[in-house]
Each structure stands twice: as C-alpha cells, then as structure tokens.
C-alpha cells in the first residue's frame, strides 16, 4: 500500500487550451499543493489519461459540477 504522505505530487505547468467534452471525463482531483507553481484541476479521462485544466475557467467548473452530480447519483 503506497504511503499517501510521501506520494509524489503531480504538478501542472500548463493548462489545456481545449474545452474537453464532459462525456470524455471520468473523474477529477484538485491540485492545491504548495509544491506546485499553480493551482489546477486534473481530469482523468475514460481512457485513463490526465488533463491539466485551469480551475478559473467556466467549462472546468461546469465539468467538475457534472462529475460531482454523477458521483452523488446512486446507480440503479
């Protein structure tokens, strides 16, 4: 089991300049570590790739909201 405390932090040095289709996104995490040069959102796609995105952009906020709602909706 990896030690989360010592796990390396993924930092984003640049953000995508493309709006990613929400259907392509599976999950996200926020990067707020002081070890990183800027705050970021990292989306994980349905093919398990990571995308660095700017949390200030509306499409990023909308996508996070969408994924949050998906997580909250119970599967039947």
């Amino acid at each position: 089991q990896p030690d989360a405390i010592n796990a390396p932090v993924t930092c984003c040095y640049n953000f995508t300049n493309r709006k990613i289709s929400v259907q392509r996104l599976a999950s996200y995490r926020r990067i707020t570590s002081s070890k990183c040069p800027k705050e970021a959102v990292i989306f994980k796609t349905i093919v398990a790739k990571e995308i660095c995105a700017d949390p200030k952009q509306k499409w990023v906020q909308d996508s996070m909201d969408h994924l949050d709602k998906q997580t909250q909706t119970p599967k039947t």
């Epitope: 993924t10 930092c11 984003c12 040095y13 640049n14 953000f15 995508t16 493309r18 990613i20 289709s21 259907q23 392509r24 990067i31 970021a40 990292i42 989306f43 796609t45 093919v47 790739k49 990571e50 995308i51 660095c52």
Partner: antibody
Framework: QVQLQESGPGLVKPSQTLSLTCTVS??????????WNWIRQHPGKGLEWIGY???????YYNPSLKSRITISIDTSKNQFSLTLSSVTAADTAVYYC???????????WGQGTMVTVSS | DIQMTQSPSSLSASVGDRVTITCQAS??????LNWYQQKPGKAPKLLIY???NLETGVPSRFSGSGSGTDFTFTINSLQPEDIATYYC?????????FGQGTKLEIK
C-alpha cells in the same frame, strides 16, 4: 513554447535494434497532463501511432508493435526514447515525437527523423 | 482497432474553390476526431479537434463537421498555401488510428 527534437541513427541494419531520443525544450517533461508520443510515417504513406509515455513512466503501446517496442523517459535530461527491436525493411520510416495534453490531440511535433533499415 | 477511411485519396482544385474531404470510421466514435495538415517534408499540424473545433491560430476557412461514423473536413476558399496532405485521426479508444490521407493539389 515547448519544442521537440528527435535524434538517432539514420541507418540501422536488419535484425538490429533502433534507438531514437526526443529532447523536450521550452518546458518540463514532468509537467502533469503531457503525454509524450512516437508516431511514424512510412515513405509516401500515412501515419502510424506507436505509443506514449507519461512522466510517471506509464506507457501505452500500439498492440501491432507491442512485442518489439519500449518507450522510456529520463526526466533529468528532459528526454524520452523509443527502442524498436528486430527491425526489418518494413520499419523504414520517418519517426516523429509528438506531445498531447491528455486530450488525444497531437499539438506539438518534432521535425521528424528518417530511419532506413538496410544492410 | 478502428479503421479510418478517407476519400478521396487525392484531389485537384483551383484557388478559391470549396474543397471537401470525408473520413469514415469503422464504428461509432462520437465526435472524437482530429484533422491534421501535413506539408511536404514537414511534420503534421493540428487543425481541428473534437470533429469541429478549430485549433488556436488556424484560419477560419478550415472547418469540420460530423459525428458517429461520418465526418467532413472543408476548406471554404482554397489558398495556394493549403497545398498539403490532410489526415483524420480518431481517439475514441486506444490505439489511435489515422486515415490514409488526402493529397490536395492546385489545378
């Protein structure tokens, strides 16, 4: 502005191993969200995606080449590399390195390096 | 793997013409399609992503459309500098695959 530059031998003998390196300048190869790809183009033909590597070392290889290829990364040198074993004349191609930002679009390319497999 | 079929394989057109290239996927790929331009002796250049979105800095005479299995790439008013080979690329799933290319020449 990130730039990519391929380097390696232009001539390789059949059955030998081809090794190419792509040097990333103008940005860190360790930046999250950047995937570092190899793509080749046979003379006068279309494009064939070979595989990618992430800064973490995660890789994905085209199944058609998987048994012969290895993509590795050296974050200290800001480089990633391709090795292709047991080459034949069919591996003669221009080899490109390219970046995608996790969104599956190759937005930055090297200029390409021609590799000929011949004895 | 998904097969991408481009047509025509080559075409000749005059400056100012409207040029259309099609790309057909062997299965539904939603809008997960990119278009690239490759000039002789150069690396490909991304023009359009997600089937219809213009990459930053690309002239507005280029456009793309389509979804599912059938896609179209259009140059509205052909310019001499548009002489190149154009490729589609799907990214519905890995491994990525490209069309065989359409070589565009000026009449």
């Amino acid at each position: 502005q990130v730039q990519l530059q391929e380097s390696g031998p232009g001539l390789v003998k059949p059955s030998q191993t081809l090794s190419l390196t792509c040097t990333v300048s103008g940005g860190s190869i360790s930046s999250g969200g950047n995937y570092w790809n190899w793509i080749r183009q046979h003379p006068g033909k279309g494009l064939e995606w070979i595989g990618y590597i992430y800064y973490s070392g995660n890789t994905y290889y085209n199944p058609s080449l998987k048994s012969r290829i290895t993509i590795s990364i050296d974050t200290s040198k800001n480089q990633f590399s391709l090795t292709l074993s047991s080459v034949t004349a069919a591996d003669t191609a221009v080899y490109y390195c390219a970046r995608d930002g996790g969104d599956d679009a190759f937005d930055i390319w090297g200029q390409g390096t021609m590799v000929t497999v011949s004895s | 793997d998904i097969q991408m079929t481009q047509s025509p394989s080559s075409l000749s057109a005059s400056v100012g013409d409207r040029v259309t290239i099609t790309c057909q996927a062997s299965q539904d790929i939603s809008n997960y399609l990119n278009w690239y331009q490759q000039k002789p002796g150069k690396a490909p250049k991304l023009l359009i992503y997600d089937a219809s979105n213009l990459e930053t800095g690309v002239p507005s005479r280029f456009s793309g459309s389509g979804s599912g299995t059938d896609f179209t790439f259009t140059i509205n008013s052909l310019q001499p500098e548009d002489i190149a080979t154009y490729y589609c690329q799907e990214y519905n799933n890995l491994p990525y695959s490209f069309g065989q290319g359409t070589k565009l020449e000026i009449k």
